[in-house]
């Protein structure tokens, strides 16, 4: 069961896995959740009754029964990992800790104007896990305004001490706020021969890359495939680092693959969720249980529902045996990866899906797209919403996109003349406008947040957020779309679609069925040539055919320009403005979402 509250003055006895240092019990709980085996923890707060060397210790614990005996102890705070919970989990920690010095390897020291600037520096430095900043009031003159960037093997401090007039905090890479490049390429027949920080077994290079991404010290990796000549190294995943942050040594070697940590793009790709099945593959590890199951899918469900199960191997039933049920071996290891991977024994293996909730919901695969045609089918664009106004009568006003369970991203110009959020209704999971009746459920709007630099669509900043009164429960027909990564600024999107219920020509009416059109992106230089009377800024993005014919139009405003990249859909643009609709040499102009990621995160993550 999911227990979220913390137990004050309580200590769990026994079950210790390891001890780390965290600045708060709340963060100790996050560290426990992300640890492959931790189910419970005990944190020691700062207290006069407690030995200062034990302050801020976070003891990670495991138990076969999923609980441990409780003992009363002043200053101890205990709790359970969120592994047992079904809600979305994030490692993002924006808290600033006053008068705490988080110890680590101080590898970079520089002057910064503020703690925020120091945190930004840490977020944009490939090695930085956390920082300590000496404020203006720091007693030692030569240390004032000094920003120390730090890292450790675990990503958590090696110790935490009280120190007046300093503040500490963590890198915001896991909050999607890093400007570091996101290099998704996997390089075949390549070995990176830099320092290894760890090695694990993985079934393929993609899993190896995901493990690298959530390993605190891994910057890039090399994976030896199952065809690697040296049998003892097949399926070996080497997690690597270097001083420069880039591989210094690339060696051509067949059957090896190498790539980079996806830390800077982890909010828009699955990192923890290894959802594939590996046929004719056996994962070895500590056996948790052996149960009968009808299929490998059923075995994966059993593993996902068993909180301690990390991976499994399913051996299909021999004909007519055991009512056609095979054996499902539920397994675990110290690091969450198989201790060995064997091929050719007929097993089907995979991982728990319990960790998928640590990834952004937007990375979930949606059903295959219908090619051709202009009308969409149900569930094809599950992030698309229709925004209605009820004044003076109810009608479709604009499109919008679900980007979080309480947030819709749309265009600012949609709210011209809208006096109050009370007159707005957001309908999700809708294909046809005719489905919307008096009793159709909708989301009320609590708040309209328009970019404060917005004046008119043509001059940019045409972006707005709607905070919903209630949260969206994600289903196949209503789920979020990923925001583009700041590290993906140089990606060339080739599979982009504009969707909406808008006009099909300049003088028309709102369409009943959600329409879709595949539209190529146009460079800003090319777009500027087509709109000489306007300034096409880098905060805008253009799309359209030279000959015209396909475009967004009236009523599509605020809706998404959705682009598929590496199997994940990204909200690249918001339908904003254009000269007419689908005119020759007049591309549509969209708000360039990647340029507003900071603004979106600032508004949606505000406490």
């Amino acid at each position: 069961e999911c227990v979220t509250q913390l137990l004050k003055d309580t200590c769990f006895e026994g079950g210790d896995i390891t001890t780390v240092f965290t600045p708060s019990a709340k963060y100790c709980q996050v560290v426990c959740t992300y640890h492959p085996r931790c189910l419970l923890f005990t944190f020691t707060a700062e207290s006069p009754s407690e030995d200062p060397t034990r302050w801020f210790t976070c003891v990670l614990k495991d138990s076969v029964t999923e609980t441990l005996p409780r003992v009363n102890r002043t200053a101890a705070i205990s709790g359970y990992s969120f592994k047992q919970c079904s809600h979305q989990i994030s490692a993002c920690n924006k808290d600033i800790y006053v008068d705490l010095d988080m110890k680590g390897i101080n590898y970079n020291s520089s002057v910064a104007k503020s703690a925020q600037e120091c945190q930004e520096r840490c977020t944009d430095d490939v090695h930085c896990h956390f920082f300590t900043y000496a404020t203006r009031q720091f007693p030692s003159l030569e240390h004032r305004n000094i920003c120390l960037l730090k890292h450790t093997q675990t990503g958590t401090p090696t110790r935490i001490t009280k120190l007046d007039k300093v503040v500490s905090g963590f890198s915001l890479k896991s909050c999607a706020l890093s400007n570091l490049a996101c290099i998704r390429d996997i390089f075949p027949n390549t070995v990176f021969a830099d320092s290894n920080i760890d090695s694990v077994m993985a079934p393929d290079a993609f899993v190896c890359g995901r493990i690298c991404t959530h390993h605190p010290g891994c910057l890039f990796f090399t994976f030896f495939s199952q065809e690697w000549p040296k049998e003892s190294q097949r399926n070996l995943c080497l997690l690597k680092t270097s001083e420069s942050g880039l591989p210094s040594t690339r060696i051509k070697k067949s059957k090896a693959l190498s790539g980079f940590s996806l830390q800077s793009c982890r909010h828009s790709i699955p990192v923890f969720c290894h959802s594939s099945f590996y046929h004719d593959t056996d994962f070895l590890g500590e056996e948790l249980d052996i149960v009968a199951a009808k299929s490998h899918e059923a075995c994966q469900k059993l593993c996902t529902n068993a909180v301690r199960c990390q991976f499994f191997t399913y051996t299909p039933a021999q004909a007519s045996c055991n009512e056609g049920k095979g054996k499902c071996y539920l397994k675990l290891s110290s690091n969450g990866s198989p201790t060995k991977i064997l091929h050719g024994r007929g097993g089907i293996s995979g991982y728990t899906l319990r960790l998928c909730k640590m990834d952004n919901e937007c990375t979930t695969k949606i059903k295959p797209r219908i090619v051709g045609g202009t009308a969409s089918v149900r569930g094809e664009w599950p992030w698309q919403v229709t925004l209605h106004t009820t004044s003076p009568t109810q009608r479709h006003l604009c499109g919008g996109s679900i980007i979080g369970n309480q947030w819709i991203l749309t265009a600012a110009h949609c709210f011209y003349g809208v006096e109050s959020p009370k007159i707005l209704r957001v309908y999700s999971g809708i294909l046809n406008q005719s489905e919307i009746k008096e009793d159709t459920s909708f989301f009320g709007v609590q708040e309209i947040i328009i970019h404060d630099q917005y004046k008119m669509a043509e001059s940019g900043y045409d972006i707005a957020l709607l905070k919903l009164e209630t949260t969206v429960n994600y289903t196949d027909s209503q789920r979020p779309i990923c925001l583009p990564s700041k590290g993906d600024r140089n990606v060339i999107y080739t599979d982009c679609w504009v969707t909406g219920w808008g006009y099909r020509k300049l003088r028309d009416k709102i369409q009943n069925t959600l329409q879709k059109a595949k539209i190529p992106l146009v460079t800003n230089e090319e777009c500027q040539k087509r709109y000489r009377g306007h300034k096409i800024t880098h905060k805008m993005i253009c799309a359209g055919y030279r000959e015209g014919g396909k475009d967004a139009c009236k009523g599509d405003s605020g809706g998404p320009l959705s682009c598929k990249h590496n199997e994940v859909w990204h909200l690249v643009g918001i339908t904003s403005w254009g000269e007419g609709c689908a005119q020759r040499e007049r591309p549509g102009v969209y708000t360039n979402v990647v340029e507003y990621v900071d603004w979106i995160l600032e508004k949606t993550q505000a406490v």
Partner: nanobody, 126 residues
């Protein structure tokens, strides 16, 4: 028990030459990718040169044009010919088999299937 035994280290003057050898036993030498690493006092372990099982070679920028790696599969031996030696080449030189990168900057810890020799000291000094 896999064994890698280095020899040929010693004291040499700047500009001088040395030839290091590494004799391997208890594994299939010709199928292995071999390498020389070095570790100077207080420094991290660094890759000097690699020769793959199919004869492909790699050299660190700092030794390019001065060092030559070679192997004699019939003798299960790896060589490193070091010319124009400089004081900054002073280090313990380690022979390694199927070891793609050092672990934690240390020339002794390996991952599955990777092996290290015990090292031979090269001192370049006048």
């Amino acid at each position: 028990q896999v064994q890698l035994v280095e020899s040929g280290g010693g004291l040499v003057q700047p500009g001088g030459s040395l030839r290091l050898s590494c004799t391997a036993s208890e594994f299939t030498f010709d199928d292995s990718d071999m390498a020389w690493y070095r570790q100077a006092p207080g420094n991290e372990c660094e890759l000097v040169s690699t020769i793959t099982s199919d004869g492909g070679t790699y050299y660190a920028d700092s030794v390019k044009g001065r060092f030559t790696i070679s192997r004699d599969n019939s003798k299960n031996t790896l060589y490193l010919q070091m010319n124009s030696l400089k004081p900054e080449d002073t280090a313990v030189y380690y022979c390694a088999a199927d070891q793609w990168g050092s672990a934690e900057g240390d020339c002794t810890s390996s991952y599955p299937g990777g092996y290290w020799g015990q090292g031979t000291l090269v001192t370049v000094s006048s």
